[in-house]
Interface confidence: low
């Protein structure tokens, strides 16, 4: 808490300008009118205040707006935003996309902070939905933000936003999220030719159904083992040995190293051993020759 002291004669601030950087903390508290600061917030960014001075300016705004800052002030916070706590931000009602962009710009290049996460949450709640413009903005600043959304929230992500996503931004997505993102990625990249398409869609294939994996197997894509291991087990199981061989191309040899891990392990159990033997990899655990394979899943579904 800054102690209340009278402003020295001649030091009362008439406007927010560079002369204030020479003020001590107690002088800023005493000589800068909070209402003046609020109306000239846009100038603060251009002045090289110290962090300690910024603390004083924040304190003045907090006193003026105990219920939360108005958007006219929030939009011009600039690097003063970095001083805000999530508790401060929860008091705000941010509805303008320009305000959101201005504050995200301040944090650009850094990991998503608790302040930014709270800001985004407040903004989305204020708008009532994740509209296209909001998502375009959020994915431009934080492509990894997609994986922080629930599958229900992801359903309103426009395919155009997918272009901003980098492979590493999907690292934290779980299969349920990829189930939602994959059809959007397929739509976003649909006009690319086969090889370019595969490069782009590869990160999303954890949400691909069997039919699409079968189609990809006809296109000489040479999927790497890391991608194959992230595929849905239920999508991999119906693939034949020949389809997996085509899908992986030269990477098929990597199956041996992964034979004890899902989905390879479960897939091996579904294949005839003589089919597996054609790969020449020494994969074991397939259905012995001469055994009859009954698919009971359809029977269960009907009963």
């Amino acid at each position: 808490e800054v102690e209340k002291t009278a402003c020295p004669s001649g030091k009362k601030a008439r406007e927010i300008d560079e002369s204030l950087i020479f003020y001590k903390k107690w002088e800023l508290e005493a000589c800068v009118d909070a209402a003046l600061l609020a109306t000239q917030m846009d100038r603060v960014n251009a002045i090289p205040f110290t962090y300690e001075q910024l603390d004083v300016l924040k304190h003045k705004l907090d006193e003026l707006y105990p219920q939360g800052y108005p958007e006219s002030v929030i939009q011009h916070l600039g690097y003063l935003f970095l001083k805000m706590s999530p508790e401060d931000i929860r008091k705000w009602n941010v509805t303008s996309l320009e305000t959101l962009k201005a504050l995200l710009e301040v944090n650009k290049g850094h990991e998503m902070s608790p302040q930014v996460a709270t800001l985004i949450d407040r903004f989305v709640k204020g708008r009532g939905q994740l509209d296209k413009d909001t998502l375009d903005t959020l994915t431009a600043f934080y492509p990894g933000y997609l994986c922080s959304l629930s599958p229900e929230e992801l359903s309103s992500v426009p395919p155009s936003s997918i272009w901003a996503v980098r492979p590493q931004d999907l690292d934290t997505c779980d299969p349920r999220q990829l189930d939602v993102l994959y059809p959007k990625a397929r739509l976003a990249f649909q006009n690319m030719n086969g090889s370019e398409y595969f490069v782009k869609i590869q990160s999303f294939l954890g949400g691909a159904p069997t039919e699409d994996l079968k189609a990809l197997s006809q296109q000489n894509v040479s999927m790497d083992l890391a991608t194959f291991m992230k595929l849905r087990t239920d999508a991999v199981l119906p693939l034949t040995v020949a389809e997996v061989q085509k899908l992986l191309g030269p990477h098929v040899e990597g199956l041996k190293a992964e034979e004890r891990h899902r989905p390879v392990r479960d897939w091996i159990l579904r294949q005839r051993q003589d089919d597996l033997d054609t790969l020449g990899l020494g994969l074991q655990g397939g259905i012995p020759n001469g055994y009859l394979v009954l698919d009971l899943s359809m029977q269960e579904a009907l009963s």
Epitope: P159, K184, R186, L187, Q190, Y197, F198, E211, A215
Partner: nanobody
């Protein structure tokens, strides 16, 4: 297995209209783009309209823009091509086609003949 069956072709006078229908069955319908191609005698196949399955974005070449309209009915698993202001040069066999996104149009119907003549 994917199956596409066209109907609605026939003989029509210049300036007239026709509506072609395509019934789609199999996994393909909800996940692929659908299109209409035509092939006139002695010429190659030409795309005249396509529609994306998810967002229904449409595409038309300049030769039919403003005259042809492609549409779809998800519930009935149908794709339609409404052809207005038909010209003699529109005479061709019209094929319904389905497109796997990474591979181009790979599934075709048997075709339906459209003849524009007075």
């Amino acid at each position: 297995e994917v199956q596409l069956v066209e109907s609605g072709g026939g003989l029509v006078q210049p300036g007239g209209s026709l509506r072609l229908s395509c019934a789609a069955s199999g996994y393909i319908y909800g996940f692929y783009a659908m299109g209409w191609f035509r092939q006139a005698p002695g010429k190659g196949r030409e795309l005249v309209a396509s529609i994306n399955s998810i967002d229904s974005i449409t595409y038309y070449p300049d030769s039919v823009e403003g005259r042809f309209t492609i549409s779809r009915d998800n519930a009935k698993r149908m794709v339609y091509l409404q052809m207005n202001s038909l010209r003699a040069e529109d005479t061709a066999v019209y094929y319904c086609a389905a497109r796997y996104i990474a591979a181009g149009f790979g599934y075709w119907g048997q075709g339906t003949q459209v003849t524009v003549s007075s």
